[in-house]
Each structure stands twice: as structure tokens, then as C-alpha cells.
């Protein structure tokens, strides 16, 4: 089922990302640089292990995980979080927890695009990727 996500994706649009980062608690300086970045996302699968890489002028990150198993993640904005990613109806649901806070990132395929929906409390950001 994750095969639909495999490949290299480039960011083509971003909506409400600064407001989302503010709600997460990201400082101004980090928000500014992160908001300007146009990351490529590279997703691969090897057996049970899924790898998601993000590459940009801001920061390069990589996570490798097994669905449903909690793992440690250092986010691009430098949060040290506990993450769990599950597959729910074809949607990769990524929950990050840190400092008593929680945010959810949903990755889903829509037509030929990969849509990433970031939710923190009542604030939602939608970022759309196309195949590179």
C-alpha cells in the first residue's frame, strides 16, 4: 500500500505553513528560514522499513520506521520528538509528541500529487508535492 508514496517529490505549494509553525511553537528565526525552503521529499520502502528523506537548503532530515512502532525523530525545525506513523485508509498518519504537545502530519496521494496536511490544535497547513 505504501508503494504509491515511493519516489522523489518536490514541493509546489504551501498554505498556512507559518501559522502552523507558530502554533507548534517554532521561533521566528527558524520559521523564516523553514518557510522559504522548497524541500524535496524522497520516500523509499525496504521490506517493513519505510524511509522518508527531506532535502532542502534549510535542513536535510531522514527518518526510517516501521508502521505502528514509536521512534525518535529530530525534526527539521530541531524538535526532539517521539513519533509514530500508521497507515489509515491509504493515508500515512504521523503523530509527533514533545514537551507535552502533539501534532499530526497526514500524507496522502491525490491524483498525481502527494498532499501533506499538518495539524496543530486548530491550525492546519496544506503542502502539495509533485513528482520531481
Amino acid at each position: 500500500m505504501c508503494d504509491a508514496f515511493v519516489g522523489t517529490w518536490k514541493l509546489v505549494s504551501s498554505e498556512n505553513f507559518d501559522d502552523y509553525m507558530k502554533e507548534v511553537g517554532v521561533g521566528f528565526a527558524t520559521r523564516k528560514v523553514a518557510g522559504m525552503a522548497k524541500p524535496n521529499m524522497i520516500i523509499s520502502v525496504n521490506g517493513d522499513v519505510i524511509t522518508i528523506k527531506s532535502e532542502s537548503t534549510f535542513k536535510n532530515t531522514e527518518i526510517s520506521f516501521i508502521l505502528g512502532q514509536e521512534f525518535d525523530e529530530v525534526t527539521a525545525d530541531d524538535r526532539k520528538v517521539k513519533s509514530t506513523i500508521t497507515l489509515d485508509g491509504g493515508v500515512l498518519v504521523h503523530v509527533q509528541k514533545w514537551d507535552g504537545k502533539s501534532t499530526t502530519i497526514k500524507r496522502k496521494r491525490e491524483d498525481d500529487k502527494l498532499v501533506v496536511e499538518c495539524v496543530m490544535k486548530g491550525v492546519t497547513s496544506t503542502r502539495v508535492y509533485e513528482r520531481a
Epitope: 507558530k22 517554532v26 521566528f28 530541531d78
Partner: antibody, heavy 119, light 108 residues
Framework: QVQLQQPGAELVKPGASVKLSCKAS????????ITWVKQRPGQGLEWIGD????????TNNEKFKSKATLTVDTSSSTAYMQLSSLTSEDSAVYYC????????????WGQGTTLTVSS | EVVLTQSPALMAASPGEKVTITCSVS???????LHWYQQKSETSPKPWIY???NLASGVPVRFSGSGSGTSYSLTISSMEAEDAATYYC?????????FGAGTKLELK
């Protein structure tokens, strides 16, 4: 260990310019922004601006926009701040500091460069 | 710009005394972005508390931080001689980043 090395002092004449340096070591230079802070004798701290070495992106406090120019040389892991049209008001200690992402606090500081503007 | 008002500006405390320094912020900020620094004479500021309540490396556990929204504080549970210094609060939520004017803490 993380270190930010700054020259101890600079003496320059009014109207001149000066380029202050901040050499970073002990971490990946392009991973964290470098910020600059001014402290006049006996006074508090003022944020001048910051630069992200990975992208070269800068943000200046409006108050210092025409005064300070921030640059980096990634090959030598050094950040620079050029101060122009110097007056006695620019006499101060200038610190560089590393910005720790997310929280955006200054987790490592240089020793500071004491700039004296005098004829 | 966001103004940080520290109080008191100057205070003296005896060894063993509890000390509280407050930082009032002119508009609400994320608690993740309120920080405290300690500075002693002729030396660089040191990160002391970040994200309102996280102690920086090497900071004694007698220090603590709390607050949210527009009201924050730094507390020393039992004053020691080495705590005499100037403490600055700083916000990183909004442009430009700003500092409080500082609280000078002296040993009585």
C-alpha cells in the same frame, strides 16, 4: 565541543567601517543560524540580526538595517558582520551566538569583540 | 516590537533566600520561545533557561522557570553566592527578537 571565536578588540575611526569575525567549530556550521547581539557599556542586550549559513538568508533588526551587513564563509566556518559609517554610538561589545532551532535560543556565545570608535 | 519588562531591575538576596524575577511580555508569545540568560561582569551571557522551563546544560536544579502567554518568571529556590549576576529574559516568537532590560541580582 562547540566554540565561537571572536577577536578581543577593534579600534576604528569615526566614519570608517569594520568587519567583525566569528569562527565556529565543533559542529556542522551550516546546521544552525548565527546571530549577532550588541551590548553597550553598562547596558542591556540588543539583537542585531541573524544569518543562516546553509542558505545565506539573513534577517536584520530594522534598527540595524543600514548599519550591519551579515555574511558567512562556509569554507572556513566563519560568520562576519560589517558595520559601516561608525560613530561613538557603535562603541560596544558585539557577540555572535549560535541559534538553536525550534526554541530559537542562543545556546553558545562567542567571547565578544569590544569595538571602540574613536579618533 | 514585543517589549519585555523585567522586575525588579535590582535586588539583593541573602544566602538561602528564595528569589523570583518576573518578565512581563507586551503581547502573548509561545512558551517555547521565552528564554533566560545569566551574565556576570565582563563575560558573555550564558543560556540559563530555555522554552520557559528547560534548564540549560550545567544550570543548578535550584533554578526553575514558569509562565505562559504574557507572564513569565525565573525562580531560585535557595540563593547561593554564585547566583549573583544579571539575568535577562528574551523572546523569540516575533520579529524583532527582543530582550528585557535585565535584573541585577546581588548577594546581601
Amino acid at each position: 565541543q562547540v566554540q565561537l571565536q571572536q577577536p578581543g578588540a577593534e579600534l576604528v575611526k569615526p566614519g570608517a567601517s569594520v568587519k567583525l569575525s566569528c569562527k565556529a567549530s565543533g559542529y556542522t556550521f551550516t546546521s544552525n543560524a548565527i546571530t549577532w547581539v550588541k551590548q553597550r557599556p553598562g547596558q542591556g542586550l540588543e539583537w542585531i540580526g541573524d544569518i543562516s549559513p546553509g542558505s545565506g538568508s539573513t534577517t536584520n533588526n530594522e534598527k540595524f538595517k543600514s548599519k550591519a551587513t551579515l555574511t558567512v564563509d562556509t569554507s572556513s566556518s566563519t560568520a562576519y558582520m560589517q558595520l559601516s559609517s561608525l560613530t561613538s554610538e557603535d562603541s560596544a561589545v558585539y557577540y555572535c551566538a549560535r541559534l538553536r532551532g525550534y526554541y530559537d535560543y542562543f545556546d553558545f556565545w562567542g567571547q565578544g569583540t569590544t569595538l571602540t570608535v574613536s579618533s | 516590537e514585543v517589549v519585555l519588562t523585567q522586575s525588579p531591575a535590582l535586588m539583593a538576596a541573602s544566602p538561602g533566600e528564595k528569589v523570583t524575577i518576573t518578565c512581563s511580555v507586551s503581547s502573548s508569545i509561545s512558551s517555547s520561545n521565552l528564554h533566560w540568560y545569566q551574565q556576570k561582569s565582563e563575560t558573555s551571557p550564558k543560556p540559563w533557561i530555555y522554552g520557559t522551563s528547560n534548564l540549560a546544560s550545567g544550570v543548578p536544579v535550584r533554578f526553575s522557570g514558569s509562565g505562559s502567554g504574557t507572564s513569565y518568571s525565573l525562580t531560585i529556590s535557595s540563593m547561593e553566592a554564585e547566583d549573583a549576576a544579571t539575568y535577562y529574559c528574551q523572546q523569540a516568537s516575533h520579529y524583532p527578537l527582543t530582550f528585557g532590560a535585565g535584573t541585577k541580582l546581588e548577594l546581601k
